[in-house]
């Protein structure tokens, strides 16, 4: 609601203003009436029976101050010209409102020519004889405005040209947009502008402990001519550690926090935090609990997980399958990952070292989310120790580690991988491979073969190489072939038994 700043109030002045009348005593004059034991003053004129009336009433000089546009509210009565028999020719039912600006008070020096007409003031309702005699006068209210004003002060004047008028109230005021708190911004009392289409842009200031959010617009409002605030732009938000309570920002209570400038209220400190002081932007973690850099302040403090609960290592030739179960204590987090490390030890010397370079994992061994992994390319007759470490988002904040280990001894080489390189009606050319780390342990390879379906006899060939040609074979016959590595410590794991067929005589040309 616009604020009105009153510059002149005749009704409130109790007849003390002493306005100038011209001609003196013959036209407008001050009158007093008593209503409810209170004096009511009015300026009245009623020379309706005489023609050529030109009676002026001029206010005292009114200091303009900061006003740009003034509003003039008049309360008055006008009597019906028909109340005056024979006066209809000269009687009027309107009067004229004028103003004049000046930088000084002219006192009793009244000059009509200095005045500019604002408007002819006509009543909405006239007071007829019967109403007048019954004391039921019809009060009219009219408002006009003038602006922009530029001089130090001004006068208003009322010209009577033969009406029967009583002027009960003259109130002159200007409008201000009142001091305002909106969107946690304070807008100062602002003088309304003088031009109807224009809106004065007013910058607001954030209330104590409020800020313009990053990337947000500075608070602004527009003060309209009628003293109303319009078109709010931007806003302020309570800063970290403060929340909105009505039109102010209040510090978070102890045990509560707010970590950023936002519209949200203060939140209760989460689990595993220490009680916060007043105005906290975060809640510190209890001893042994931590917050990862990316953790929101609203999240409970957490700790590293315990070790994987149960770890098994199952050897399969030169492979080991590691399986484990999640930690019993996740530390309050869901971002658990596992890392697998490998150590190998030579039984003869007891010497140990890392074996990451020589083994192969079924998937990268760091940042594992599954609870199993297969390790292959293990060397025979070697002792392996596998460590599975559980980590979460706060593990990096502590020096201790949460891990479980499992050891396994590899007694055999990995089975060779066998391929048929070529064949004829009487021969089969076979090759094989084993992982390079294991090759140094191999003394010879033993190739066993026999006809399919003949379980009574078999042939053995030994070689140091990685291939052999088996000849003197029967045509168009299926042979079962198996390759096994021989090491100083004994036999390694045999390959799968492969079925290879020699060519038939009629297909030998192929």
């Amino acid at each position: 609601q616009g604020k009105e700043v009153v510059l002149l109030d005749f009704a409130a002045a109790g007849g003390e203003l002493g306005w100038l009348t011209h001609p003196y005593g013959k036209g407008w004059d001050l009158m007093q009436n008593i209503m409810n034991d209170m004096p009511i003053y009015m300026y009245s004129v009623c020379n309706v029976m005489s023609g050529d009336q030109d009676n002026w009433l001029r206010t005292n000089w009114v200091y303009r101050g900061e006003a740009e546009r003034i509003f003039i509210e008049l309360k008055f009565t006008v009597r019906d010209c028909n109340s005056f028999p024979g006066g209809a020719s000269s009687c009027k039912e309107t009067f004229n409102l004028y103003y004049a600006e000046s930088d000084l008070d002219y006192g009793t020096n009244f000059q009509k020519r200095l005045f500019t007409k604002i408007d002819t003031i006509a009543p909405d309702e006239i007071t007829v004889s019967s109403d007048f005699e019954a004391r039921h006068v019809k009060l009219n209210v009219e408002e006009r405005s003038v602006g922009p004003l530029t001089r130090k002060g001004f006068y208003l004047a009322f010209q009577d040209i033969g009406a029967c008028v009583a002027l009960l109230s003259v109130r002159v005021y200007y409008k201000k947009c009142p001091e305002l708190l909106q969107g946690l911004a304070h807008f100062p009392e602002t003088i309304a502008g003088s031009d109807a289409p224009s809106l004065a842009t007013v910058a607001g200031t954030c209330v104590d402990h409020a800020v313009v959010p990053p990337g947000g617009e500075e608070p602004r409002m527009h003060c309209a001519v009628d003293g109303e605030w319009l078109v709010p732009i931007g806003q302020c938000l309570c800063q970290a550690g403060y929340e909105k309570v009505e039109d102010a920002c209040q510090a978070c209570s102890p045990g509560f926090f707010k970590f950023e400038a936002s519209e949200s209220p203060c939140l209760e400190c989460p689990e595993h935090t220490l009680p916060s002081p007043e105005g906290a932007t975060s809640c510190e973690c209890e001893e042994g609990f931590f917050r990862a850099p990316q953790d929101p302040a609203s999240m409970p403090c957490t700790r590293p997980p315990s070790a994987p609960h149960y770890l098994t290592a199952v050897g399969m030739g030169a492979k080991v399958e590691l399986r484990w179960t999640p930690p019993q204590d996740s530390g309050g987090r869901e971002d658990i990952v596992y890392s697998v490390t490998c150590e190998q030890c030579w039984p003869e010397s007891g010497e140990c070292g890392p074996c990451e370079a020589s083994v192969r994992y079924s998937e990268p061994p760091h940042g594992l989310t599954r609870t199993s992994v297969t390790v292959s390319d293990l060397e025979p007759h070697m002792n392996y120790t596998f460590t599975v470490e559980a980590r979460n988002g706060v593990s990096g904040l502590v020096t201790s580690r949460s891990f479980r280990t499992a050891s396994v001894s590899i007694n055999q080489t990995e089975p060779p991988k066998v391929r048929l390189e070529g064949r004829s009606t009487t021969s089969l050319s076979v090759s094989w491979s084993i992982p390079p780390p294991q090759q140094s342990r191999v003394w010879k390879y033993e190739v066993t073969y026999r006809k399919k379906g003949d379980s009574n006899s078999y042939n053995v060939r030994r070689t140091e190489g990685f291939s052999v040609t088996l000849d003197d074979l029967a045509p168009d016959t299926t042979y079962l072939v198996q390759v096994q590595a021989l090491t100083q410590e004994g036999q390694g794991a045999g390959s799968k038994v492969h079925e290879f067929q020699t060519l038939s005589p009629e297909g030998s040309g192929n």
């Epitope: 003196y24 005593g25 001050l30 009158m31 009436n33 009623c46 309706v48 005489s50």
Partner: antibody, heavy 120, light 110 residues
Framework: QVQLVQSGGGLVQPGGSLRLSCAAS????????MHWVRQAPGKCLEWVTV????????YYADSVKGRFTISRDNSKNTLYLQMNSLRAEDTAVYYC?????????????WGQGTLVTVSS | SSELTQPPSVSVAPGQTVTITCQGD??????ASWYQQKPGTAPKLLIY???NRPSGVPDRFSGSSSGTSASLTITGAQAEDEADYYC????????????FGCGTKLTVLG
């Protein structure tokens, strides 16, 4: 106590002059319009003249216009009526009176009256 | 015209009600004021405006107006009310500033 005390009346020959005074007390004299009203022996009250609170404006009844002059000295709280070219028909008791509001009254405070007799 | 006309005299028995009238064109435009004058003294304001009494004036005195007529009514007249009564009004004709009636002599019988 609000009062108006008059002085200066008496017997004067036709064509002569006389000055009446009216001393005010008990109120802010400079805030009120002041009037002179007369009453011929056994006759009606007759309004004579008015002066505005600041003394800048005066108005006279046609019967005395050009012969009588109303004035005031607000510093002395005193109202005056200078009567020149007096006539027999000016014989009357002269009252000063205060207009309670505005220029035309009503007249709420009256002086005690002073008799002016114009006779040869 | 700018004249106010009053009856020269009226009489009333003590305790009775009496009305003094005042006629004039100005009374259409302006309210009358009423004054009481006792012999050898200055007039005293009784009624002004619609029907306003200055402090100290008994409430048995009242005023009213209608058209070109104004009235002063004394309800329950008393012996001390015997006096001359004058009506007065602003002049709407522009001839005079203010006009008085010629007064009404009130006699309280008994």
């Amino acid at each position: 106590q609000v009062q108006l005390v008059q002085s200066g009346g008496g017997l004067v020959q036709p064509g002569g002059s006389l000055r009446l005074s009216c001393a005010a007390s008990g109120f802010t004299f400079s805030s009120y319009a002041m009037h002179w009203v007369r009453q011929a022996p056994g006759k009606c009250l007759e309004w004579v003249t008015v002066i505005s609170p600041d003394g800048h404006n005066t108005y006279y009844a046609d019967s005395v216009k050009g012969r009588f002059t109303i004035s005031r000295d607000n510093s002395k709280n005193t109202l005056y009526l200078q009567m020149n070219s007096l006539r027999a028909e000016d014989t009357a008791v002269y009252y000063c009176a205060r207009a309670s509001v505005g220029a035309t009254g009503p007249f709420d405070i009256w002086g005690q009256g002073t008799l002016v007799t114009v006779s040869s | 015209s700018s004249e106010l006309t009053q009856p020269p005299s009226v009489s009333v028995a003590p305790g009775q009600t009496v009305t003094i009238t005042c006629q004039g064109d100005s009374l259409r435009s302006y309210y009358a004021s009423w004054y009481q004058q006792k012999p050898g003294t200055a007039p005293k304001l009784l009624i002004y405006g619609e029907n306003n009494r200055p402090s100290g004036v008994p409430d048995r005195f009242s005023g009213s107006s209608s058209g070109t007529s104004a009235s002063l009514t004394i309800t329950g007249a008393q012996a001390e009310d015997e006096a001359d009564y004058y009506c007065n009004s602003r002049d709407s004709s522009g001839t005079h500033l203010t006009v008085f009636g010629c007064g009404t002599k009130l006699t309280v019988l008994g």
